[in-house]
């Protein structure tokens, strides 16, 4: 297993609709054809997997149908979008990149993107 540098923004504020997008960029030492991207969430010392996708270079990322993540790839960059976020989902979202094929296997873990989610103010009751 060889180490690889992964860069991601330090902090992002999600939209009022609970959507957060950020770029995860990895310094690929070789010409990988198969890449796996995993998003981990760390909050209060707990780490949980949010979503993961394996893709062939030049193809779209495919997450599971019920995943809250979507993404696109361009060269050594992955554009990740996480949706359906609420205030309770605020935390550090860490991008983990694995170059699966061809060998050697490379692993890179970013420092994390602190995503803040602000629940929208409830609308005042109306008479209509």
């Amino acid at each position: 297993c060889k180490a690889m540098h992964v860069a991601q923004p330090a902090v992002v504020l999600a939209s009022s609709r609970g959507i957060a997008s950020f770029v995860c960029e990895y310094a690929s030492p070789g010409k990988a054809t198969e890449v796996r991207v995993t998003v981990l969430r760390q909050a209060d010392s707990q780490v949980t997997e949010v979503c993961a996708a394996t893709y062939m270079m030049g193809n779209e990322l495919t997450f599971l149908d019920d995943s809250i993540c979507t993404g696109t790839s361009s060269g050594n960059q992955v554009n990740l979008t996480i949706q359906g976020l609420r205030a309770m989902d605020t935390g550090l979202y860490i991008c983990k990149v694995e170059l699966m094929y061809p060998p050697p296997y490379y692993l890179g873990i970013g420092n994390g993107t602190q995503i803040y989610v602000i629940d929208p103010e409830p609308c005042p009751d109306s008479d209509f």
């Epitope: 902090v11 205030a87 605020t90």
Partner: antibody, heavy 116, light 108 residues
């Protein structure tokens, strides 16, 4: 090294607007947030809000909502805070700071005096 | 809005003594997202602690933070002359983010 340099002191009349700038250097501007905090003379710190320089999304203190606007110019790595309809109790030192989880780097502060 | 109440308002101690500052929240602070700042007259605040217990870069280990939920503490194990200042807590776990009113640590 990381530096945040704010614009100079301002004297404004009640009802006017003020726009304070905060120029960042020494780091990747769009990777961080900019938080704004003010401090009235002899008083404590008051959080005003923050902006994500990555996407421009903002979160304002409710008491300032409608009067405050925070923006960034990523081409010059500068953040701006505009406060409208100024009142005498807006007299304060206004600070910007680089935000992730706490403000680790601060500007030097901008004194805004509101007086007729 | 979470109200942070700092106590005591003023702490009179001598250099070398231990200082214990409290910050109580009106409701639980999510993810232990609480920071402590030090401020000296005429200067911008300085971040000491974030995430309730993580020391910021370059902060001496005599400063430590602890707590969760609604009760947080900043401890200065042995006061140095340069530690006499005003200390603020700030929560950023629940919007709107808020500061406490401050605790002044003065020389006895």
């Amino acid at each position: 090294q990381v530096q945040l340099v704010q614009s100079g002191a301002e004297v404004k009349k009640p009802g006017a607007s003020v726009k304070v700038s905060c120029k960042a250097s020494g780091y990747t501007f769009t990777s961080y947030g900019i938080s704004w905090v003010r401090q009235a003379p002899g008083q404590g710190l008051e959080w005003m809000g923050w902006i994500s320089a990555y996407n421009g999304n903002t979160n304002y203190a409710q008491k300032l909502q409608g009067r405050v606007t925070m923006t960034t110019d990523t081409s010059t790595s500068t953040a701006y805070m505009e406060l409208r309809s100024l009142r005498s109790d807006d007299t304060a030192v206004y600070y910007c700071g680089r935000w992730v989880r706490g403000v680790e780097y601060w500007g030097q502060g901008t004194l805004v005096t509101v007086s007729s | 809005e979470i109200v942070l109440t700092q106590s005591p308002a003023t702490l009179s101690l001598s250099p070398g003594e231990r200082a214990t500052l409290s910050c109580g929240a009106s409701q639980s602070v999510n993810n232990r997202y609480l920071a402590w700042y030090q401020q000296k007259p005429g200067l911008a605040p300085r971040l000491l602690i974030y995430d309730a217990s993580t020391r910021a870069t370059g902060i001496p280990d005599r400063f430590s933070g602890s707590g969760s939920g609604t009760d947080f503490t900043l401890t200065i194990s042995r006061l140095e002359p340069e530690d006499f200042a005003v200390y603020y807590c700030q929560q950023y776990g629940n919007s709107p983010w808020t500061f406490g009113q401050g605790t002044k640590v003065e020389i006895k």
